[in-house]
Interface confidence: low
């Protein structure tokens, strides 16, 4: 119960707090459990105890092991254990799972990524931040105190984020890095009565006989994941699949785009080799969700050939 896992990289600073808490006035003794050897408090040592904190400045792979801390008060003693593992630095970019701190989730409204364990260190701003080993650049990223803020979070922002800072101890500087995964979750979405962006109601589209023509039905339904949203075309009030004209087809699949955070769908109607009789049909763009159905009607008209008279 009073055991804590801690990890770090060789040649970086690592500071571990005793899992048992006590008043600042209580003394804390630290021991290396395997040998029961007391950890010194003198700061000239590479590994030393400083009250509730155990400091590795810097850490070495050989420091790995279980450390015991005993919080002593006039009336009781409390014992805790710190399981410390120091890893060799990876030569490649991948951060293994065992070096990862807890995953955090963000959304459009809340995109703070806190640098893990930083409160234990004596550091000064600014923090450096990396995503998948690349330094973060651009106005969307703001290092603010001990956390990173990402503006206009998108699903592509998910990934592994590493913070890097300098710990200062008696004038000596030590590097520290910590990595955690960031996932992007949908804001609580909402759905609205469908809004058709294209075509305009009662639009007349000019087409050339014998050429191909495309009509796009585009509608938005709300924000976030939509339980049900569909965009489709009808010909004279009949589904395309039932109309039976192989020259006129809907584009398979619907592209869900998020424009300004809105969930929108497009459906393209492709008319091959436009014929005179196509001009007589009524083309309905239908957008529907659980709020209801909206319909915009389009008709085709013959595009007059351009005159080339001098």
């Amino acid at each position: 119960k009073f055991s804590k896992q801690s990890w770090g990289l060789e040649n970086e600073a690592l500071i571990v707090r005793c899992p048992r808490q006590g008043k600042p006035s209580y003394t804390v003794d630290w021991y290396y459990s395997q040998t029961n050897k007391s950890i010194p408090t003198q700061e000239r040592n590479r590994v030393f105890a400083s009250g509730q904190l155990l400091k590795f400045l810097p850490a070495a792979v050989a420091d790995s092991g279980i450390y015991t801390c005993i919080v002593r008060s006039p009336t009781f003693n409390r014992t805790g254990y710190a399981n410390v593992t120091i890893y060799k630095k990876q030569s490649d970019c991948n951060v293994p799972d065992y070096l990862m701190y807890s995953t955090v989730s963000g959304s459009e409204k809340n995109s703070k990524i806190y640098c893990p364990t930083i409160d234990l260190y004596n550091w000064t701003a600014p923090l450096e931040w990396f995503k998948n080993c690349q330094a973060l650049q651009g106005s969307r990223y703001r290092a603010h105190k001990s956390f990173l803020v990402i503006d206009n979070v998108m699903t592509e922002d998910a990934g592994d984020y590493t913070c890097k800072f300098i710990h200062n101890e008696n004038g000596a500087n030590y590097s520290v890095t910590a990595t955690r995964s960031f996932t992007v979750k949908d804001e609580q979405g909402f759905s609205l009565f469908p809004v058709i962006g294209a075509p305009a109601q009662n639009e007349i589209k000019e087409v050339e006989i014998g050429k191909n023509a495309n009509l796009t039905c585009s509608a938005c339904f709300g924000k976030g994941t939509q339980f049900l949203a569909a965009v489709l075309w009808q010909l004279n009030g009949t589904k395309i699949t039932d109309f039976g004209e192989p020259r006129i087809q809907q584009e398979e699949g619907q592209n869900q785009s998020f424009s300004n955070g809105l969930a929108c769908l497009d459906m393209v109607l492709r008319i091959a080799d436009v014929k005179e009789e196509d001009l007589l049909l009524q083309y309905d763009c239908l957008a529907l969700n659980l709020h209801g159905l909206r319909r915009h009607t389009v008709r085709l008209s013959r595009k007059n050939p351009i005159d080339h008279h001098s």
Partner: nanobody, 117 residues
């Protein structure tokens, strides 16, 4: 707000049929768009079928040709007729209703459909 109660779920063999009912109270379902959703164990809730006040229907690709949604305004009940059932149709089926001036769904408690031999 409309209250929804589903019924008709149960155990059925592959290839069999079931008819789910969604009885509404509190409001007339003619004011609402009705939908059926399902949630299989460990999966997210997914859309199955919807029916609009004008009688227009829409189905998820996975159930097209097998499931039929309908509504009887006089009984204030929506139905989901499920034919040619498959093991992958096993799920809790939920009825949902939403009015055009609302941004939230009203949900039933769900009815379990198990397709197994």
């Amino acid at each position: 707000e409309v209250q929804l109660v589903e019924s008709g779920g149960g155990l059925v063999q592959p290839g069999g049929s079931l008819r789910l009912s969604c009885a509404a109270s509190g409001r007339s379902i003619s004011d609402y768009t009705m939908g059926w959703f399902r949630q299989a164990p460990g999966k997210e809730r997914e859309f199955v079928a919807g029916i609009w006040s004008g009688g227009y229907t829409h189905y998820a690709d996975s159930v097209k040709g097998r499931f039929t949604i309908s509504a009887d305004n006089s009984k204030n009940t929506a139905y989901l007729q499920m034919n040619s059932l498959k093991p992958e149709d096993t799920a809790v089926y939920y009825c949902a209703a939403v009015s055009s001036n609302s941004e939230t769904f009203d949900w039933g408690q769900g009815t379990l459909v198990t397709v197994s031999s």
